[in-house]
């Protein structure tokens, strides 16, 4: 049984205390009330750095 904070969830997922397992953050778009969505970033990181002149 995973102790929260000891082993991070895979990228794109977050720990659910209600299910005691990592859950896919992609589902938070459909159901944002899920407890694990608090641990999901609001938006994925940009795939490249924006360079300004």
């Amino acid at each position: 049984e995973r102790v929260p904070g000891t082993t991070p969830c895979p990228r794109g997922s977050s720990w659910s205390a209600d299910l005691d397992k990592c859950m896919d953050c992609a589902s938070c778009r459909a159901r944002p009330h899920s407890d694990f969505c608090l641990g999901c970033t609001a938006a994925p990181p940009a795939p490249f750095r924006l360079l300004w002149p």
């Epitope: 049984e1 659910s16 205390a17 209600d18 299910l19 005691d20 859950m23 589902s27 459909a30 159901r31 009330h33 899920s34 407890d35 694990f36």
Partner: antibody
Framework: EVQLLESGGGLVQPGGSLRLSCAAS????????MMWVRQAPGKGLEWVSY????????HYADSVKGRFTISRDNSKNTLYLQMNSLRAEDTAVYYC?????????????WGQGTLVTVSS | DIQMTQSPSSLSASVGDRVTITCRAS??????LNWYQQKPGKAPKLLIY???SLQSGVPSRFSGSGSGTDFTLTISSLQPEDFATYYC??????????FGQGTKVEIK
């Protein structure tokens, strides 16, 4: 065969306490979230409480918050509901149910229920 | 809490009839909608989950459809054992799951 068997119901006076049990068999109990649902005589279904597989996370309906406590003993394959400060409106058949392995999506097996009657 | 409203509250039908029960949510719940059957003195039984997925062991005459706020449970050809009360349940706004008030299917 999956089985959930509730016990502990009965007649209790207002303000009294009861502890319900739900004995699970036919499946590995520890990975599953569980919940209690009640049904007042002649009425519909009302969700009461939810507990995570480890027991570390619990949730309650507003109508029972602060009075009821859900818990589980995974070594005994048993779910509990401690009910304190009981009121007449708590009179109902109480069912335990097994959750699926995704987030709160459905409850696929239910016990036969145990009747709690709160009356003086 | 999200309110679930079923219609009709009761209906009379004959064996072989096609029966449709509707469930409306007070706000969008995507496809997080389940249907249960309950017979008198018995526990509820899961029929349909995620709006349209048939639970294992449930006869194929039962089907579910809908998304957002409007959902339907259809029994294509009513059988004697189908006379019961049916409940919808939303699992979108967790943990406060809520049930519809029920639809009683009676013999005409």
């Amino acid at each position: 065969e999956v089985q959930l068997l509730e016990s502990g119901g009965g007649l209790v006076q207002p303000g009294g306490s009861l502890r319900l049990s739900c004995a699970a068999s036919g499946f590995t109990f520890s990975p599953y979230p569980m919940m209690w649902v009640r049904q007042a005589p002649g009425k519909g279904l009302e969700w009461v409480s939810y507990i995570s597989p480890s027991g570390g996370s619990t949730h309650y309906a507003d109508s029972v918050k602060g009075r009821f406590t859900i818990s589980r003993d995974n070594s005994k394959n048993t779910l509990y509901l401690q009910m304190n400060s009981l009121r007449a409106e708590d009179t109902a058949v109480y069912y335990c149910a097994r959750g699926g392995d995704t987030y709160f999506d459905y409850f696929d097996y239910w016990g036969q229920g145990t009747l709690v009657t709160v009356s003086s | 809490d999200i309110q679930m409203t079923q219609s009709p509250s009761s209906l009379s039908a004959s064996v072989g009839d096609r029966v449709t029960i509707t469930c409306r949510a007070s706000q969008s719940i995507s496809s997080y909608l389940n249907w249960y059957q309950q017979k008198p003195g018995k526990a509820p039984k899961l029929l349909i989950y995620a709006a349209s997925s048939l639970q294992s062991g449930v006869p194929s005459r039962f089907s579910g459809s809908g998304s957002g706020t409007d959902f339907t449970l259809t029994i294509s050809s009513l059988q004697p054992e189908d006379f019961a009360t049916y409940y919808c349940q939303q699992s979108y706004s967790t943990p406060g799951i809520t049930f519809g008030q029920g639809t009683k299917v009676e013999i005409k």
